[in-house]
């Protein structure tokens, strides 16, 4: 019988008492085969973290700073359940640390040196750790003691709880630096008052502070937020302009064998029976013998953290950067305006080799990082292990939902002004063999399908979106008799046709021979009835253009396109017979790397782009013998986006809506994780 006990870790006598009450009340409402609670008492949260890592306990609730400690080796814990605040309809699991300024003050984030600062309190998250962590490498050296460096950075501050004797400048705006509400500038409201009164130039608070202190929109409009990209935004745009997004209070467990499903089952049942306004007997979110025992008293319930989410992703790049800076205190030798090398994310070993070749030729301007799937690459870019990669539109959507931004677009048509003119897009098509003359768009049920990969534009999102509108369910593996859609579940009929060997079968990378445009077409040639690809795929792989044995004798005339009106047309008539227009592939990065990725890639394409005529003796960035490694092989240049610099603007309303509709069919664990952070 599996052990269904969750050993909860308590850090005080009062918590242990509440834990025992929790245990007893759960026993009274949950059947004997359901989850149960046991209580383990430790002296501190850090002791609880160590106990969970050592399998002496299973769960504890922590604030963000401790979630970071819990994630670090050798603890390796992960977030499994989040407390939420507000209502069940609009649950808040995060708050945003922001920098508020007066509208007419005219400076940006990179111009804070010499300004006057208002903090909620020394050592507090939004008011100190996050802003000072993010500014850490701009502080004057020596950076230890930190208070002295901060005092020398700003021209005056109010940092309640600081030592006014040793660091008088930190108390200049609030004599004495009192560490309670007796100091009018203490806490969130106090720090905002410090700004409002004109004592300071910037207040480091959380996003809700300004709304709690100024009910009137006209009053709020006198203030703005400083963004990390050195722009400003209105105070209600905090989701797009903050210093960090911080989880409020989170249950953590072991990453391996951590009982995360059991913990969720326990807490879900606990909130049903003992949540807000549920029971007089025992209340989960109430602490008669103290404050915030086991859980925050202000919590309204729990939400399950998506399994794909590790602590780094949960805490977010900005928060992790800030805390790491404060803890480790390491900065680059001297901050320069020079761009650091761009870390390109390469999928599997084929792309890695091409990336290494690029790295060698770029003389270190490009470095390479490997991942097994596109989603793993996106996650690495999110957390700073990698910086950039070029993505199909379907993944631009996921990357955008995860906070990344498009920076340059692949262009596929030769033009005089290629780099300045991003194209409207390419065509997603359905290709069949001419010999299968009875096959149309309307009788695909039961046929064998070939897809570039799950989640990609031409190979999945467009055809499956159209199909979903027709069949109104997500069971595409039942609609087609079998197929190859790399990235599907291995036991799905949509992996049956794939050709990868062993663990590589149906993997969404080049180790699966039927992956990508060329792979999906090969699948049609060798096994399938229909391939969902781009309009250039057939001509690029016929007429001897692809020297591989399977392709070298193919003829374009042996293939036709399926049109949505039930007719068929020759391959060259794609403009009048396609499924939809697809946005071109685009390079994505984090917002903080946008300028450098743009600059370095434009230099690189001038050196190794389509102006290089002899690719047999020189490195060519946009060539890999039909394998589409790192970039599509038909890329002519990488083009500026001008104002299409968010994923929504880049992909266009129609495509975003189409992918949004398919979301209910999504198997993307990364998309689930990112929409948890930003619904």
């Amino acid at each position: 019988v599996p052990d269904k006990t969750v050993r909860w870790c308590a850090v005080s006598e009062h918590e242990a008492t509440k834990c025992q009450s929790f245990r007893d009340h759960m026993k009274s409402v949950i059947p004997s085969d359901g989850p149960s609670v046991a209580c383990v008492k430790k002296a501190s949260y850090l002791d609880c973290i160590r106990a969970i890592a050592a399998n002496e306990a299973d769960a504890v609730t922590l604030d963000a700073g401790l979630v970071y400690d819990a994630y670090l080796a050798p603890n390796n814990l992960k977030p499994v359940v989040a407390e939420f605040y507000g209502s069940k309809e609009d649950p808040q699991t995060f708050y945003y640390a922001v920098a508020v300024v007066k509208k007419d003050s005219g400076f940006q984030m990179n111009q804070l040196r010499g300004k006057k600062s208002c903090h909620t309190g020394l050592g507090r998250s939004a008011g100190w750790n996050i802003p000072i962590g993010l500014l850490y490498c701009d502080l004057p050296e020596p950076r230890k003691p930190l208070e002295k460096a901060v005092a020398n950075f700003f021209s005056g501050s109010c940092a309640p709880c600081a030592d006014g004797t040793d660091f008088p400048q930190l108390c200049q705006l609030c004599p004495g630096c009192g560490c309670s509400t007796l100091n009018q500038y203490f806490g969130y409201s106090g720090a905002f008052k410090c700004l409002k009164d004109g004592a300071g130039d910037v207040a480091f608070v959380k996003h809700s502070t300004i709304f709690e202190n100024l009910a009137n929109k006209a009053d709020r409009d006198q203030y703005e937020l400083l963004c990390l990209d050195n722009t400003r935004k209105p105070v209600d745009e905090y989701k797009d302009c903050h210093l960090a997004q911080v989880p409020s209070h989170t249950v953590v467990a072991r990453s391996m064998g951590g009982k995360e499903d059991l913990i969720w089952e326990l807490l879900n049942q606990a909130q049903e029976h003992f949540g807000k306004d549920k029971s007089k007997e025992f209340q989960l979110f109430s602490s008669p013998h103290g404050k915030d025992l086991l859980f925050k008293d202000s919590a309204h319930g729990f939400l399950k953290v998506p399994p794909r989410m590790d602590a780094k992703m949960y805490l977010g790049y900005e928060y992790v950067t800030a805390i790491r800076n404060l803890r480790e205190g390491t900065c680059p030798e001297a901050p320069t305006d020079e761009c650091k090398p761009v870390k390109w994310c390469a999928l599997s070993h084929h792309e890695r080799l091409k990336c290494d070749e690029w790295s060698v030729n770029s003389v270190g301007k490009i470095e390479c990082v490997s991942a097994e799937t596109t989603e793993d690459c996106i996650a690495k870019i999110m957390n700073g292990e990698a910086d950039a990669m070029s993505l199909d539109g379907g993944f631009v959507y996921i990357a955008g939902k995860c906070g990344l931004v498009p920076v340059l677009a692949e262009n596929y048509n030769k033009s005089d002004n290629c780099e300045d003119t991003p194209e409207a897009g390419y065509f997603a098509i359905a290709v069949v063999k001419k010999s299968a003359s009875d096959l149309t768009w309307d009788n695909l049920k039961g046929k064998k399908s070939c897809h570039t990969a799950v989640g990609r534009t031409a190979g999945w999102n467009i055809p499956m979106g159209l199909l979903y509108n027709k069949i109104n369910h997500c069971r595409f593996d039942e609609f087609f008799s079998e197929g190859c859609a790399p990235g599907s579940k291995k036991d799905s009929s949509l992996c049956k046709l794939c050709m990868g060997s062993g663990l590589n079968l149906c993997e969404p990378n080049n180790k699966e021979g039927y992956y990508g445009y060329t792979g999906a077409f090969r699948c049609l040639v060798e096994k399938g009835d229909v391939a969902f690809v781009k309009h250039q795929t057939v001509p690029q792989n016929t007429g001897g253009k692809n020297p591989d044995p399977w392709a070298k004798n193919l003829n374009e005339k042996d293939y036709e396109l399926l049109c949505l009106d039930g007719t068929r047309k020759p391959v060259e008539e794609y403009a009048n017979c396609h499924l939809a227009r697809a946005p071109n592939h685009a390079v994505v990065t984090r917002k903080d790397k946008e300028a450098c990725v743009h600059k370095i890639l434009r230099q690189q394409q001038h050196l190794f782009g389509s102006n290089v005529t002899d690719c047999s003796g020189n490195f060519c960035l946009f060539r890999s013998e039909t394998k589409d490694l790192l970039f599509r092989d038909d890329t002519v240049c990488l083009a500026k986006l001008h104002d299409r610099n968010t994923y929504e603007k880049y992909l266009g309303e129609e495509y975003v809506k189409a992918v949004g509709n398919l979301r209910k069919c999504s198997t993307s664990s990364l998309l689930e994780a990112c929409t948890f952070r930003r619904p």
């Epitope: 080799l353 091409k354 070749e357 060698v360 003796g617 020189n618 490195f619 013998e625 394998k627």
Partner: nanobody
Framework: QVQLVESGGGLVQPGGSLRLSCAAS????????MAWYRQAPGKQRELVAG???????TYAGSVKGRFTISRDNAKNTVYLQMNGLKPEDTAVYYC???????????WGQGTQVTVSS
């Protein structure tokens, strides 16, 4: 197809030196960038050093200042001079010309380097 033959490996004490050679034959007109990789037991193959046709070089951080890559275009050979060898440099060393490797998955036999006292 380009054929590559690596040589020069062996057993050496920590702090010692070795010079690896890699001779290319076949369709060598297509050779542009060449590189040395290494693979230690149970680890991924990793880039050690690379050199372009014009002689521009790049090194992995762990070997910078100790290893030097060079090439002799007339002899179609690429070299890796390894000084200050450490036990963690123990691996099979492979040379590649990229045009073969990432299109055809072509690798030579490699040459074993063992650094041990």
């Amino acid at each position: 197809q380009v054929q590559l033959v690596e040589s020069g490996g062996g057993l050496v004490q920590p702090g010692g030196s070795l010079r690896l050679s890699c001779a290319a034959s076949g369709s060598i007109f297509s050779i542009n960038t060449m590189a040395w990789y290494r693979q230690a037991p149970g680890k991924q193959r990793e880039l050690v050093a690379g050199i372009t046709r014009s002689g521009t070089t790049t090194y992995a951080g762990s070997v910078k200042g100790r290893f030097t890559i060079s090439r002799d275009n007339a002899k179609n050979t690429v070299y890796l001079q390894m000084n200050g060898l450490k036990p963690e440099d123990t691996a099979v060393y492979y040379c590649t010309d990229y045009s073969s490797s990432y299109y055809q998955d072509y690798w030579g036999q490699g040459t074993q380097v063992t650094v041990s006292s």
